[in-house]
């Protein structure tokens, strides 16, 4: 069952998926000037059995300059508005991902892949939040969100993370100040599969992270 909405936004925070539940779809998107190969897959799908999960289908891009007899179905900007976008992910993975049953690892990048990845999450998916660089966790309760099915509708749980600029807070004497987290940027949440139209999307990788991070920032 696909989740109706995107994971919730947290100001000055980013979320990441450590692994993707079976049933998750990743759109095959190509960067500007490229398109999916003729009769290429529209998406990759996380599938598997009790012992192993992997991504079905392969995304392949070819130069738009190459004329094909069959018209390629490249999403137009208007169509993109109906989809959820995430920034290009790092192929580096935490070691424990492979041991999570019923989940796929982050798919490796494909040649001429678009800078944004468009995922379609399923019920049971969990994402993890952290404050972006320059902000720190004033309060870190459960800093994750899970897509759950209740009363026939899907709903993401609310992460209890409050990120604040260094100068905005004070602490009790003796309290240790948490460190600012690596850079990352939060995701848009305006419809179930939505593009990030009203704020800038930037690509970056946090060297200290061993997993993919979503990188859409509220400027």
């Amino acid at each position: 069952e696909l989740c109706d909405d995107d994971p919730p936004e947290i100001p000055h925070a980013t979320f990441k998926a450590m692994a993707y539940k079976e049933g998750t779809m990743l759109n095959c998107e190509c960067k500007r000037g490229f398109r999916r190969i003729k009769s290429g897959s529209l998406y990759m799908l996380c599938t598997g059995n009790s012992s192993h999960s992997s991504w079905d289908n392969q995304c392949q891009c070819t130069s738009s300059a190459t004329r094909n007899t069959t018209k390629q179905v490249t999403p137009q900007p208007e169509e993109q508005k109906e989809r959820k976008t995430t920034e290009m992910q790092s192929p580096m993975q935490p070691v424990d991902q492979a041991s999570l049953p019923g989940h796929c690892r982050e798919p490796p990048p494909w040649e001429n892949e678009a800078t944004e990845r468009i995922y379609h999450f399923v019920v049971g998916q969990m994402v993890y939040y952290q404050c972006v660089q320059g902000y720190r966790a004033l309060h870190r309760g459960p800093a994750e969100s899970v897509c759950k099915m209740t009363h026939g509708k899907t709903r993401w749980t609310q992460p209890q993370l409050i990120c604040t600029g260094e100068m905005e807070t004070s602490q009790f004497p003796g309290e240790e100040k948490p460190q600012a987290s690596p850079e990352g940027r939060p995701e848009s949440e305006t419809s179930c599969l939505v593009t990030t139209t009203d704020f800038q999307i930037q690509t970056e990788m946090a060297a200290t992270m061993e997993t993919s991070i979503f990188t859409t920032e509220y400027q």
Epitope: L138, H139, R140, G141, P142, Q158, E175, S188, E189, Y218
Partner: antibody
């Protein structure tokens, strides 16, 4: 079920301080930050500040710095707010509310400052 | 500080009618907005969080729209229990601020 139980109404003289409490129950207290909100006839609802129930870290609305001091006692699952140097302007109802989205509120503590 | 401007400040309506309350932020707050309902002598109660998600137990006659700087709360087919005050509030950066409120009264 989730409950935030606040201390009772206070009638105090100008110039003194008062400390009001908010006890959380029915959930893991340290999972949710605690906010304090002032409601007066003149100003509707005003956010005073927030305290991490886990670390004691605090952040205040600039307007209430020096006026309000928020603390927390994890062992009793209670958040406190002390209001100093009280004047008639501080007469209001004060609420505690939990979490990122203020999903549960205390019943309010009425504070009257009068000579 | 981000200013939240609510309109109208008050309105009268009859049971069964539809009303809309709007909230405007002085700058982009994305979807970091909550709506609260407060009945006379009671605490505020969360109605909507993150601009578009109805809180647990909130009837479907309540609907919301907007993101960025313009938001609205619509109540279809007003019920007697819907009368009271409504507030919007942002949680995009400190200090959080509330709208001035909208008092919904029975006509």
């Amino acid at each position: 079920q989730v409950q935030l139980q606040q201390s009772g109404a206070e009638l105090v003289r100008p110039g003194v301080s008062v400390k009001i409490s908010c006890k959380g129950s029915g959930y893991t207290f340290t999972d949710y930050a605690m906010h304090w909100v002032k409601q007066s006839h003149a100003k509707s609802l005003e956010w005073i500040g927030v305290i991490s129930t886990y670390s004691g870290d605090v952040s205040y609305n600039q307007k209430f710095k020096g006026k309000a001091t928020m603390t927390v006692d994890k062992s009793s699952s209670t958040a406190y707010m002390e209001l100093a140097r009280l004047t008639s302007e501080d007469s209001a109802i004060y609420y505690c509310a939990r979490g990122v989205t203020f999903d549960s509120w205390g019943q309010g503590t009425s504070l009257t400052v009068s000579s | 500080d981000i200013q939240m401007t609510q309109t109208p400040a008050s309105l009268s309506a009859s049971v069964g009618e539809t009303v809309t309350i709007t909230c405007r932020a002085s700058e982009n707050i994305y979807s970091f907005l909550e709506w609260f309902q407060q009945k006379q002598g009671k605490s505020p109660q969360l109605l909507v969080y993150n601009a578009k998600t109805l809180a647990e137990g909130v009837p479907s006659r309540f609907s919301v729209s907007g993101s960025g700087t313009q938001f609205s709360l619509k109540i279809n087919s007003l019920q007697p229990e819907d009368f009271g005050s409504y507030y919007c509030q942002h949680h995009y950066g400190i200090p959080y601020t509330f709208g001035g409120g909208t008092k919904l009264e029975i006509k």
